[in-house]
């Protein structure tokens, strides 16, 4: 592939589409290739002949959009960075090429948070009271904040508290929610403690 390359910049984890600007219409076949600098040659990602289905020589991370001859990288990764070449052959044998220099950077934003696991233990106290200790866990807890709710009321906003101690009335209705968030997403988990306190004998545990 010759000529200057279009520069395409993306962050990891998102779809990336390489789309040629203007390609003549009488297309007979196309080939998408990626330069392998170590071998000083091209690796065929995908081939397509007009009237047939695309043959994907790499894997299912790539797909081909026939309508505009684009290559779609379904979830770009850093190793997808490099020089890509589209070679279009017309029915008369003429070859047109389009070249793309792709840069995929690790996102500075975190991944979406996963759903937390809310669990705890409790102890029956005298005078019809129940003491509960709740903990809220996510396996990847970098850069996440925690918020606690009793019913719909926010009761704890210290963003780094993964646990909550409460003393409640045995006969009351008690719903607790842990909300975990980061700059791009949030998830929550809710526990209803009413039955646990009423049915418990001295000490008990409750799980989601």
């Amino acid at each position: 592939c010759q000529g200057s390359a279009d520069h395409v910049v993306s962050i990891s984890g998102v779809p990336l589409q390489l789309q040629p600007n203007s390609i003549q219409t009488k297309v007979d076949s196309i080939a998408w290739k990626k330069l392998l600098p170590s071998q000083n040659g091209f690796h065929h990602i995908l081939k397509w002949e007009n009237g047939s289905l695309p043959s994907n020589t790499s894997n299912d991370r790539f797909s081909f959009i026939v309508k505009n001859l684009s290559l779609l990288i379904k979830a770009a990764q850093q190793q997808d960075s490099g020089l890509y070449c589209l070679e279009v052959t017309s029915i008369s044998g003429k070859v047109q090429t389009a070249t793309f220099q792709v840069f995929v950077f690790e996102s500075l934003l975190p991944d979406k948070v996963e759903k937390p696991r809310l669990q705890g233990q409790g102890k029956i106290l005298d005078r019809g009271r129940c003491q509960v200790a709740l903990s809220c866990l996510v396996s990847r807890d970098g850069n996440v904040s925690y918020a606690w709710y009793r019913g719909s009321k926010l009761i704890q906003t210290a963003g780094n508290l993964t646990y909550l101690d409460e003393e409640v009335d045995i006969n009351g209705t008690h719903t607790y929610t842990c909300n975990v968030s980061n700059p791009v997403s949030w998830e929550s988990h809710t526990l209803n403690l009413t039955q646990d306190c009423q049915n418990a004998h001295q000490e008990f545990r409750f799980w989601p």
Epitope: I91, S92, K94, V95
Partner: antibody, heavy 119, light 108 residues
């Protein structure tokens, strides 16, 4: 000046093969597709196939698959056509033609190679 | 394959006469994909008109081309002796490219 210089006339026996050449000059060899066209005596024109010296891309008319084989040599700016298992039906003038750069017309024609197949 | 049919097969025209020949495609083609070639006895064909209406280099302006879809025409406004030849139409809208059977233009 663009020129397509074809090899001379051939008189061959049935069942044999022949290889004719077309030497291109006056332009950048790898920038243009070259086609071959057959014309039987007193008849019309028939497309055989093309070769693109840029990437050695080749396509044949279905009718000539197995009959014609196209090759090219960048070092001498020459394309070749092999015709095999010759019969009297192959007796014709064979033209080497250059495909236009923009639209798909044949802008330059060689002088033709006359092939006569006779026992 | 797209079949190209030229009519009439032979035209006898007087010098100075207006001449029109027709090329009909078996299916619709783009006007940019229809071309005409002139061939004289013992010579190679020459590109004469390309993309329906564009005259090739050196072609006299008395020649013109027109048409669209399946019907295309080559016209000579005033026949001259040097125009006597066979004219072939050619499509490269679909592969394989195909030629008409030719119209032989002779002087009456």
């Amino acid at each position: 000046e663009v020129q397509l210089q074809q090899s001379g006339p051939e008189l061959v026996k049935p069942g044999t093969s022949v290889k004719m050449s077309c030497k291109a000059s006056g332009y950048t060899f790898t920038n243009y597709v070259l086609d071959w066209v057959k014309q039987k005596p007193g008849q019309g024109l028939e497309w055989i196939g093309y070769i693109n010296p840029y990437n050695d891309g080749i396509k044949y008319n279905e009718k000539f698959k197995g009959k014609a084989t196209l090759t090219s040599d960048k070092s001498s700016s020459t394309v070749y056509m092999d015709l095999s298992s010759l019969t009297s039906e192959d007796s014709a003038v064979y033209y080497c033609v250059r495909l236009g750069y923009d639209e798909d017309y044949f802008d330059y024609w060689g002088q033709g190679t006359t092939l006569t197949v006779s026992s | 394959d797209i079949v190209m049919t030229q009519s009439p097969p032979i035209i006898s025209a007087s010098l100075g006469e207006r001449v029109t020949m027709t090329c009909t495609a078996s299916s619709s083609i783009s006007s940019s994909d229809l071309h005409w070639y002139q061939q004289k006895p013992g010579s190679s064909p020459k590109l004469w008109i390309y993309s329906t209406s564009n005259l090739a280099s050196g072609v006299p302006v008395r020649f013109s081309g027109s048409g669209s879809g399946t019907s295309y025409f080559l016209t000579i406004s005033s026949m001259e002796a040097e125009d006597a030849a066979t004219y072939y139409c050619h499509q490269y809208h679909r592969s394989p490219p195909t030629f008409g059977g030719g119209t032989k233009l002779e002087i009456k």
